[in-house]
Interface confidence: low
């Protein structure tokens, strides 16, 4: 069956060193446990996180994300997942694409992560 993939529709903001959460889901909602779900960086197609065959495929990740991502799957049976990126870096800023693949049918959604400096301040002088 066909579906749409829907991202947050607004930039996700996170502080350097903090966590970022990128939500993504299919509509209409359906069980995505058996689907392939992933995020890659746009436009470079570097794999940020990949879930396939019911498991996180850590070996597929780009080295700069290894050990820093977690796919929150509590609601995957409803077609909703969230990618958590830990210890956010300035280099994480930019475009991300989430995709769901059900056999040969794939749809995706773009989203943006904005990274901010918690110590940034404006000199009043």
């Amino acid at each position: 069956g066909q579906f749409r993939v829907i991202g947050p529709g607004y930039p996700i903001r996170a502080l350097v060193g903090d966590e970022a959460e990128l939500p993504c889901r299919i509509s209409p909602g359906k069980n995505a446990t058996g689907m392939e779900v992933g995020w890659y960086r746009s436009p470079f197609s570097r794999v940020v996180h990949l879930y396939r065959n019911g498991k996180d495929q850590d070996a597929e990740q780009a080295p700069e994300y290894r050990g820093r991502t977690e796919l929150l799957k509590e609601t995957i049976s409803e077609g909703k997942v969230t990618l958590r990126i830990q210890n956010v870096r300035f280099s994480d800023e930019g475009g991300y694409t989430c995709f769901f693949r059900d056999h040969s049918y794939q749809e995706e959604a773009a989203m943006e992560l904005k990274v901010e400096d918690p110590f940034y301040w404006v000199n009043p002088g």
Epitope: P8, G9, E19, E21, E74, K80
Partner: antibody
């Protein structure tokens, strides 16, 4: 089954403070953003505030910004709304609502708790 | 802030009739629109999300349509328990998430 139970409402004088609590059960609380939505007597619904799963992101309606603070305790499966400098126009039933899996609709609601601000 | 306007304010119909409720956004909200039902003394209940998808457990007589600025909730054949207040809500431009003022569906 999913349950949300609000408490802490009551009668308070203008300028006063109140803390609302919402106890959640029947689902993995730490995986859901949570919201507060209010409804003045005989009026429509007004979104008040929300908080992300890890408490890093909190948003507020302009009408309560600087006066209300939302927080959560994932260990206690609870979300809170601390209200200061209360005004007559804050009088409403306050509902705690679960976010529909990160998509900013509200799929489960509590029964509400009435906050009355009056001198 | 996006303003949601519902019409009519009150709709008087009989059980078995078809109900059509409208919601208009002050600017495009794409398909990011939900419908809720609220009965007296109760909390709202999610009926439709993303303009046309029924929430879990919602009967097939409820359907939603529309995109952009104009949306419709249709109840194909009214049951006695359907008489209530209905609200639309957008999540396209947030915060805040804004609701319409409501349409009261009453028994004729």
């Amino acid at each position: 089954q999913v349950q949300l139970v609000e408490s802490g409402g009551g009668l308070v004088k203008p300028g006063g403070s109140l803390r609302l609590s919402c106890a959640a059960s029947g689902f993995t609380f730490s995986s859901y953003s949570m919201h507060w939505v209010r409804q003045a007597p005989g009026k429509g619904l007004e979104w008040v505030s929300d908080i992300s799963t890890n408490s890093r992101t909190r948003n507020y309606a302009d009408s309560v910004k600087g006066r209300f603070t939302i927080s959560r305790d994932n260990a206690k499966n609870s979300v809170y709304l601390q209200m200061h400098s209360l005004r007559d126009e804050d009088t409403a039933v306050y509902y705690c609502a679960r976010d529909y899996g990160g998509i900013y609709y509200f799929d489960y609601w509590g029964q509400g708790t009435l906050v009355t601000v009056s001198s | 802030e996006i303003v949601m306007t519902q019409s009519p304010a009150t709709l008087s119909l009989s059980p078995g009739e078809r109900a059509t409720l409208s919601c208009r956004a002050s600017q495009s909200v794409s398909s990011y629109l939900a419908w809720y039902q609220q009965k007296p003394g109760q909390a709202p209940r999610l009926l439709i999300y993303d303009a046309s998808n029924r929430a879990t457990g919602i009967p097939a007589r409820f359907s939603g349509s529309g995109s952009g600025t104009d949306f419709t909730l249709t109840i194909s054949s009214l049951e006695p328990e359907d008489f209530a207040v209905y609200y639309c809500q957008q999540r396209s431009n947030w915060p805040p998430y804004t609701f319409g003022q409501g349409t009261k569906l009453e028994i004729k």
